[in-house]
């Protein structure tokens, strides 16, 4: 390349690099809706950020379609355990694309976390931490589902947060 | 700046992306002080490296301003539990900045790891990890605290560690 | 800008878009071994792809030197506990370098699930994730290694994967 | 909506036996504990114990264990409080309440069922 | 067991006054702390729970706060319908404890 194509890729190379997409979520006390659908956040108090990516009804919304590593931690916690089969707890990450009628598992955990209790205390906290990389075409939608997600903790939106940044 | 000004600056930039800022710190028998501050690390043996950060008493200070994935991970054992609920275990990354007296939480986790022993077994093993995107000035600090620092298992600076790199 | 320009960025973006290093691998049925070895992973179907990293049973190939932010998580389950101290699972990720003959530990966890079960179900459900930035010469290799790896439950690819990129 | 109906109010004699029910609706019965809490009269609350309703297994406090016993209909959504064996110091309300695992403490109570001990 | 002291044991107060009760626990109970709201002849209703979170359909003159082993209940604005016995519980630990209560009257 001569120097003015140089130049032209130094300018396309600042410029990505500014805009280089990236988000943190934080937890909130309208994160949990109760209603069946996603955890909600907070997208600009406090650490919560967007850039280059756009929210929208709990989902980090693609502008730029590329591989995102995408990240949630959720904050888990409650007394005892739930009597029955009812104490495992999936925290996953979802695509929502308009190519499928569905949501699409990306990162899923189970835990049992309410094993953690013990003989002389009924209180027991756990955190989930899910994070890998997957590709996203513009449009495309991610959102975090716990189940169940009563026993999802917030507080200061530093325990329980979803991001992504492109890599 | 004129044509030549840029051109510096942008082979400037060129350069500094090539250098992206990252660390992994790892750590050692030095990581627990006993004195209520943060945990310490390792820098330059085995996998310890810095590269565009600098360290400062357990700190990863921040040279260049950005958004940073910052991570760290605990590995955390004991025998038995002690009594009553101070069983819970907090693993922090928390921000240190010349505006506020006070450190900022950043991204935290409460784990109960021990009961995780079992009626056969009273040793127990944990992990926490924990990782976020944040904003970070030049010269602001990010530290690593675990309460409570006696459970944490150190070996050869794989199992607990501490990092962070520009998005 | 004109055309010119504008084509010089064009090839920039396409360059730096197609060259940093990223993979993400999902755990199969064939995952998993049981001869000794790391555990084997999906790189097409599905979520999995390789960009500018190869693959070699089970291990991720570096094709291009530099520093990765490496990771995995594996799904463990299981019903009761084994007896004895066996109840503890390490979960690992490794380097395989023609410099040395054994693998060398980057990142590893040990956790005791089985502690999970609870009095009302003896199913315990638990997930381990590993991340960190390690430096990567071309030819090195990553494997992920979990003992006891049948206590890893594989299922569709989201609950074990393993992955990496260039920061 | 989420209800524990206690039964009416009982008066007995020393050395009698009284047997309280605290019928649930409005969820799963089987997901939740239930706890028993005694308050006497001008006086606060005292926790008893509580049933595993799933499991049927009960816990007693201390100065419960003996005299009380916990039991279960779970077909009728319903747990039980007996108490054998009456003295006056039983004189008191009791309350049937859930156990809420997700941290809520005792979120659902009973309208209580009073008990008096007499000769 | 926990012994939970409650303070103070009455207190007298106005409509519109901001009130303060305080519940100091033996041991560290971390958040699991849950105020409850009894009037004569009635069963205790919950108003708070982890220490701080509101239970449904509680006003939001109502708060809490606290962990460890001091926590606070706070009301805000009484109203003349608040005139009642307050209880601070914990339930973290066996056996469950309360508090010996508040009673909350008119001047």
């Known amino acids: 390349d001569g120097p003015a194509g140089s130049w032209e890729q130094l300018i396309q190379e600042r410029r990505s690099h500014e805009v280089n997409p990236a988000a943190h979520l934080t937890g909130a006390n309208s994160s949990l809706t109760g209603s069946g659908g996603p955890l909600l956040w907070e997208t600009q108090l406090g650490l919560a950020f967007l850039r280059g990516l756009s929210y929208h009804d709990g989902a980090l919304v693609v502008t730029k379609a590329g591989y995102y590593y995408i990240y949630s931690k959720v904050q888990l916690g409650g007394v005892g355990c739930p009597l029955g089969l009812a104490s495992t707890i999936t925290h996953g990450l979802y695509k929502r694309t308009p190519r499928y009628p569905e949501e699409l598992e990306l990162l899923v955990s189970q835990q049992s976390p309410c094993g953690r209790a013990t003989s002389s205390s009924r209180v027991w906290w756990d955190s989930s931490f899910l994070g890998g990389v997957v590709h996203l075409e513009a449009g495309e939608e991610v959102v975090v589902r716990v189940l169940d997600e009563r026993l999802v903790r917030l507080r200061d939106g530093t325990r329980s947060y979803f991001g992504a940044f492109m890599v | 700046d004129g044509p030549a000004g840029s051109w510096e600056q942008l082979i400037q930039e060129r350069r500094s992306h090539e250098v992206n800022p990252a660390a992994h710190l790892t750590g050692a028998n030095s990581s627990l002080t006993g004195s209520g501050g943060p945990l310490l690390w390792e820098t330059q043996l085995g996998l310890a490296f810095l590269r565009g950060l600098s360290y400062h008493d357990g700190a990863l200070v921040v040279t260049k301003a950005g958004y940073y994935y910052i991570y760290s991970k605990v590995q955390l054992g004991g025998v038995g539990c002690p009594l009553g609920l101070a069983s819970t275990i907090t693993h922090g990354l928390y921000k240190r900045t010349p505006r506020y007296p006070e450190e900022l939480e950043l991204l935290v986790s409460q784990q109960s790891p021990c009961g995780r022993a079992t009626s056969s077994s009273r040793v127990w093993w944990d992990s926490s990890f924990l990782g976020g995107v944040v904003h970070l000035e030049a010269g602001e600090e990010v530290v690593v605290r675990v309460l409570d620092e006696r459970l944490v298992r150190l070996r050869d600076g794989t199992r607990s560690y501490f990092g962070a790199f520009m998005v | 800008d004109g055309p010119a320009g504008s084509w010089e960025q064009l090839i920039q973006e396409r360059r730096s878009h197609e060259v940093n290093p990223a993979a993400h691998l999902t755990g199969a049925n064939s995952s998993l071994t049981g001869s000794g070895g790391p555990l084997l992973w999906e790189t097409q179907l599905g979520l999995a792809f390789l960009r500018g990293l190869s693959y070699h049973d089970g291990a991720l190939v570096v094709t291009k030197a530099g520093y990765y932010y490496i990771y995995s998580k594996v799904q463990l389950g299981g019903v009761g506990c084994p007896l004895g101290l066996a109840s503890t699972i390490t979960h690992g990720l490794y380097k395989r370098t023609p410099r040395y003959p054994e693998e060398l530990e980057l990142l590893v966890s040990q956790q005791s699930p089985c502690g999970r079960a609870t009095s009302s179900s003896r199913v315990w459900w638990d997930s381990s994730f590993l991340g960190g930035v390690v430096h990567l010469e071309a030819g090195e290799e990553v494997v992920v290694r979990v003992l006891d790896e049948r206590l890893v439950r594989l299922r569709d690819g989201t609950r074990s994967y393993f992955g990496a990129f260039m920061v | 909506q989420i209800q524990l109906l206690q039964s009416g109010p009982e008066l007995e004699k020393p050395g009698e036996t009284v047997k309280i029910s605290c019928k649930a609706s409005?969820?799963?019965?089987?997901?939740?504990?239930m706890n028993w809490v005694k308050q006497a009269p001008g006086k606060g609350l005292k926790w008893m114990g509580w049933?595993?309703?799933?499991?049927?297994?009960?816990t007693y406090a201390d100065d419960f264990k003996g005299r009380f016993a916990f039991s279960l209909e779970t077909s009728a959504s319903t747990a039980y409080l007996q108490i054998n064996n009456l003295k006056n110091e039983d004189t008191a309300t009791y309350f049937c309440a859930r156990d809420n695992w997700d941290g809520k403490g005792m979120d659902y109570w009973g309208q209580g069922t009073s008990v008096t001990v007499s000769s | 067991d926990i012994v939970l002291t409650q303070s103070p044991k009455f207190m007298s107060t106005s409509v519109g006054d901001r009130v303060s009760i305080t519940c100091k626990a033996s041991q560290d109970v971390d958040t699991a702390v849950a105020w409850y709201q009894q009037k004569p002849g009635h069963s205790p209703k919950l108003l708070l729970y982890w220490a701080s979170t509101r239970h449904t359909g509680v006003p939001d003159r109502f708060t809490g706060s606290g962990s460890g082993t001091d926590f606070t209940l706070t009301i805000s604005n009484v109203q003349s319908e608040d005139l009642a016995d307050y209880f601070c519980?914990?339930?973290?630990?066996?056996?469950?404890?309360f508090g010996a209560g508040t009673k909350l009257e008119l001047k």
């Open positions: 409005g969820y799963t019965f089987t997901n939740y504990g």
């Open positions: 519980h914990q339930y973290g630990s066996y056996p469950l404890t």
């Open positions: 049933i595993n309703t799933y499991t049927g297994e009960p």
